[in-house]
């Protein structure tokens, strides 16, 4: 059974079917003989009792007050009274946006992480038996989906999925056609979970160099925002005035991670720079990854297989 209307403040859009269901419904069935009344008060009017004669748009069923449809002048306070039980709601009916398929103030926002499961199901359990068909729109363009009773989207989210999704239920009542719109503003955000950072390219790199020339050792990693990338070389970093660690450069990936690069520039290469390890490390809370570079004199290249040289 449809749950009762427990929210004390409700905003609805003019022109749509709407209902209020009080929260002592099971109790009301037990005491059928008890007098049950619905009242409305708005502005100057105090507690006017509602019944089908009040308006052709109003219907009363057991626990429910129905509007076919709700209109701007239905704004006000509503009361259900039964013996010593009273429930009150404040109803605000807002104007429909005539230039869009939905009204901005009646939108439910949802945030979905990219690549995570994303689902929209068009359901309306209260009016289910009256619904002829249901359509799903994205940014007010109809989506062609197989099921026209309960259209559904089930997929892994992509950034292209971001947008306003409107479920529009079409239903008949007393020979008139009505529709009910439920809109979701779907925002796709980057994956918030951390990755294990990884250095890009081969783990061991032999770099062919000439004495007296300069070389740039490129180190790049895919990492999280808080991870660090750094160079380690020699007994004590910074002891060689010809070695310069350039500023780190970061680029955000579409998944919300970062491509970080750090270049080690070695100027006026000397014998002391040859055949020693220059290590680039990426560190995170989850551990570290290291890749190594060894400078080799071009004349000695023949001794090393070609596939181990970097570009």
């Amino acid at each position: 059974a449809e749950s009762c209307t427990s929210r004390p403040h409700i905003t609805v859009v003019e022109g749509e079917p709407f209902y209020l269901k009080h929260c002592s419904c099971s109790l009301a069935h037990e005491i059928e003989t008890t007098t049950k009344s619905w009242y409305k008060s708005s502005g100057s009017q105090e507690h006017v009792e509602l019944n089908p004669r009040s308006s052709s748009r109003i219907a009363l069923h057991d626990c429910v007050l129905e509007f076919w449809p709700v209109e701007l002048n239905d704004t006000g306070s509503y009361f259900f009274q039964m013996k010593n039980y009273t429930q009150k709601w404040k109803l605000n009916v807002i104007r429909r946006n005539k230039h869009s398929c939905f009204t901005e103030r009646q939108v439910t926002s949802k945030i979905v992480e990219v690549k995570k499961f994303f689902q929209i199901t068009c359901e309306n359990s209260y009016y289910q038996t009256l619904v002829n068909s249901t359509s799903l729109y994205k940014n007010c363009k109809k989506l062609l989906l197989e099921n026209n009773k309960n259209p559904t989207i089930k997929k892994n989210a992509e950034f292209e999925d971001q947008g306003y999704y409107s479920c529009v239920h079409f239903l008949h009542h007393n020979g008139k056609l009505f529709n009910i719109t439920k809109t979701f503003n779907i925002t796709i955000v980057e994956d918030r979970s951390n990755i294990v950072p990884v250095l890009l390219g081969p783990k061991l790199n032999h770099v062919a160099v000439e004495l007296g020339k300069n070389v740039r050792l490129n180190c790049s990693a895919l990492l999280n925002e808080e991870d660090v990338i750094y160079w380690m070389f020699g007994e004590e970093n910074g002891s060689d005035p010809n070695i310069h660690e350039e500023k780190e450069m970061r680029i955000m990936t579409p998944e919300g991670k970062w491509h970080a690069s750090k270049v080690l520039r070695i100027e006026n290469i000397g014998e002391s720079n040859l055949n020693v390890l220059y290590n680039c490390t990426v560190a995170s809370t989850g551990g570290t990854d290291t890749k190594s570079f060894i400078l080799v004199r071009k004349a000695d290249m023949a001794d090393i297989p070609g596939h181990v040289f970097t570009r």
Epitope: G201, S220, M249, M252, H259
Partner: antibody, heavy 119, light 107 residues
């Protein structure tokens, strides 16, 4: 100092392909210290990032969702340049197109190419 | 995507006055925010990156501050050549986006 020089036609017919090239001087398209972007500007859309290419042990390309199905950005290491191709253009694609280096931010901009889509 | 809202749309000031431009992000971009200056018929020029760092060759009268969602570009004393349109841009969320701009005009 780094400079970007753009070239390509200023008039493209609807449904055809917009093609622009950006020649890099003072830097390398395969540097680890930058990415190479295309950004466009129109009165209706303002400044809009379209996509980029960059090298980090391999080539990466990222594109804006709005043009993802129509765009290709290619590096050319032999000529030290990169190009933009935008397929199936409509009058909505009329804009000034810029090629831009991304270092600390979008730090070096080409001179811009006004592209009009019209029959 | 992140929406960057710049205010005011237009700022009318005289040379020598202080200009304060605001940029607000729809969600946090950490400190990954840049400011650009654009003059008619020219490409934008980078002024400030990562919220508060001046780009190479930018005069000290330009300064940036802020983090998270609220950022400010301050021009301490306007020079005649500073009258232009200023844009903010974020790279702390995917995809990179720009604000709509603030025009600083001569009063």
């Amino acid at each position: 100092q780094v400079q970007l020089q753009q070239s390509g036609p200023g008039l493209v017919k609807p449904s055809q392909t917009l093609s622009l090239t950006c020649a890099i001087s003072g830097d390398s398209v395969s540097t680890y210290s930058a990415a190479w972007n295309w950004i466009r500007q129109s009165p209706s859309r303002g400044l809009e990032w379209l996509g980029r290419t960059y090298y980090r042990s391999e080539w990466y390309n990222d594109y804006a969702v709005s043009v993802k199905s129509r765009i290709t950005i290619n590096p050319d290491t032999s000529k030290n340049q990169f190009s933009l191709q935008l397929n199936s253009v409509t009058p909505e694609d009329t804009a000034v197109y810029y090629c831009v280096r991304e270092g600390d931010a979008f730090d070096i901009w080409g001179q811009g190419t006004m592209v009009t889509v019209s029959s | 995507e992140i929406v960057l809202t710049q205010s005011p749309a237009t700022l009318s000031l005289s040379p020598g006055e202080r200009a304060t431009l605001s940029c607000r992000a729809s969600q946090s971009v950490s400190s990954y925010l840049a400011w650009y200056q654009q003059k008619p018929g020219q490409a934008p020029r980078l002024l400030i990156y990562d919220a508060s760092n001046r780009a190479t060759g930018i005069p000290a009268r330009f300064s940036g501050s802020g983090s998270g969602t609220d950022f400010t570009l301050t021009i301490s004393s306007l020079e005649p050549e500073d009258f232009a349109v200023y844009y903010c841009q974020q790279r702390g969320n995917w995809p990179p986006t720009f604000g709509g701009g603030t025009k600083v005009e001569i009063k």
